[in-house]
């Protein structure tokens, strides 16, 4: 299922960086969240549980990230104009079944005021 | 799995329209192919087989399309500048297992010469 554009504020700017917010339903227990820039994987985070309900959090493409019970935030720093692009949150839901993939995204506009090192 | 940019010519222009080529491995027997514009589903085509090996081709979001044994082509007509965007082929493989999702894509640049109705 492709949800299309995020229906929430996906990009939060602070201190020359951006927090990209990838939401998921709080019923979801096990999942993989990938941040795509265009079609390339930039970051990922996978949450699974073992047979004894112990949680494992893994990253193959590591970015500074923050996990809550209904979102994963990925942080990009030292913004420059090359960061302007389409970004997508690619969510693979493992649990509860059935397996499902959703893609939500938006365009990250970079304005002068958001750049990390503006020329005065 | 995200394959990122298509490693083949994804966009073929003709007569003010574009053929968007979505390839899949010829070993794949049953699948769903979605054409995404940004994160929105623009077109889809699903090929499945029933118990008597009868093939079923279904579309929920119908576009003019063409199926071969290793690709689905989606056709967009009456191109204008608003068609310029990231386009992704989102392939869900059902058979052979295991279930797998791949996303490949690229940016569709629209140049004067490709528009359907140029002002002379």
């Amino acid at each position: 299922e492709i949800n299309g554009s995020a229906n929430y504020e996906m990009f939060i700017f602070h201190n020359g960086g951006v927090q990209i917010l990838c939401k998921y339903p709080d019923i979801v227990q096990q999942f993989k969240m990938q941040l795509l820039k265009g079609g390339q994987i930039l970051c990922d985070l996978t949450k699974t549980k073992g047979s004894g309900n112990k949680v494992s959090i893994k990253s193959l493409k590591f970015c500074h990230s923050q996990l809550s019970n209904n979102s994963v935030s990925f942080f990009l720093y030292n913004l420059d104009r090359s960061h302007a692009n389409y970004y997508f949150c690619n969510l693979s839901i493992f649990d509860p079944p059935p397996f499902k993939v959703t893609l939500t995204g938006g365009y990250l506009h970079i304005y002068e005021s958001q750049l990390c090192c503006q020329l005065k | 799995e995200i394959n990122g940019s298509a490693n083949y010519e994804m966009f073929i222009f003709h007569n003010g329209g574009v053929q968007i080529l979505c390839k899949y491995p010829d070993i794949v027997q049953q699948f769903k192919m979605q054409l995404l514009k940004g994160g929105q589903i623009l077109c889809d085509l699903t090929k499945t087989k029933g118990s008597g090996n009868k093939v079923s081709i279904k579309s929920l979001k119908f576009c003019h399309s063409q199926l071969s044994n290793n690709s689905v082509s989606f056709f967009l007509y009456n191109l204008d500048r608003s068609h310029a965007n990231y386009y992704f082929c989102n392939l869900s493989i059902f058979d052979p297992p295991p279930f797998k999702v791949t996303l490949t894509g690229g940016y569709l640049h629209i140049y004067e010469s490709q528009l359907c109705c140029q002002l002379k």
């Epitope: 019923i27 996978t46 073992g50 494992s56 | -």
Partner: antibody
Framework: EVQLVESGGGLVKPGGSLTLSCAAS????????MDWVRQGPGKGLEWVGN????????YYAPFVKGRFTISRDNAKKTLYLQMNSVKSEDTATYYC??????????WGQGTLVTVSS | DIVMTQSPSSLAVSPGDKVTINCKSS??????????LAWYQQKTGQAPKLLIF???TRHTGVPDRFMGSGSGTDFSLTINSFQTEDLGDYYC?????????FGPGTKLEIK
Amino acid sequence: EVQLVESGGGLVKPGGSLTLSCAASGFTFSDYWMDWVRQGPGKGLEWVGNIDEDGSTTYYAPFVKGRFTISRDNAKKTLYLQMNSVKSEDTATYYCTRWGRYAFDSWGQGTLVTVSS
Amino acid sequence: DIVMTQSPSSLAVSPGDKVTINCKSSQSLLSGNYNYLAWYQQKTGQAPKLLIFYASTRHTGVPDRFMGSGSGTDFSLTINSFQTEDLGDYYCQHHYSTPPTFGPGTKLEIK
């Protein structure tokens, strides 16, 4: 098709050691937690322990008490159970299982370990 | 550790019978909307096979005569019309906490 094939079972003396292997195919091995479950002759199923996807974390049943070690080699798609200081009560068929997110959805055929002098 | 009990320990049945196996846990297995309980079938000389997960969801390919029900601490597996190929041992198992434990099993035999 998911396949799990155990090997390495056999006769071992009390206090001895043995390593069981489980070769996996038909799925992305590195995406799944894997477990060992055993079954004594004529008895029920007993969980031995598990290992997370990249092998960094393991958990064990209380009866193991440091005697067994579970490991994995994702490049070889293989799960291991190293058994040390074995006792007669460790005699059982040992099954390699895939934890399919919410149940043991795939099992090997089992390998028999007999502890006897 | 959570203790799982099953009843009966064995049952003699005939083809076409409705069969019910009960499983009880020493504490609730309910988390959110889900009960962390699975059922397995083991035929003689074979490895166990998954039948039911989350207490009531049938695994892929499992015939619809198998039904799981229950919540909290009390669960049951029902075979609506027993077939001879259903002979074997049936185990419930929780995955609410570590260690995950199995019930002692219920053996189905032909009457």
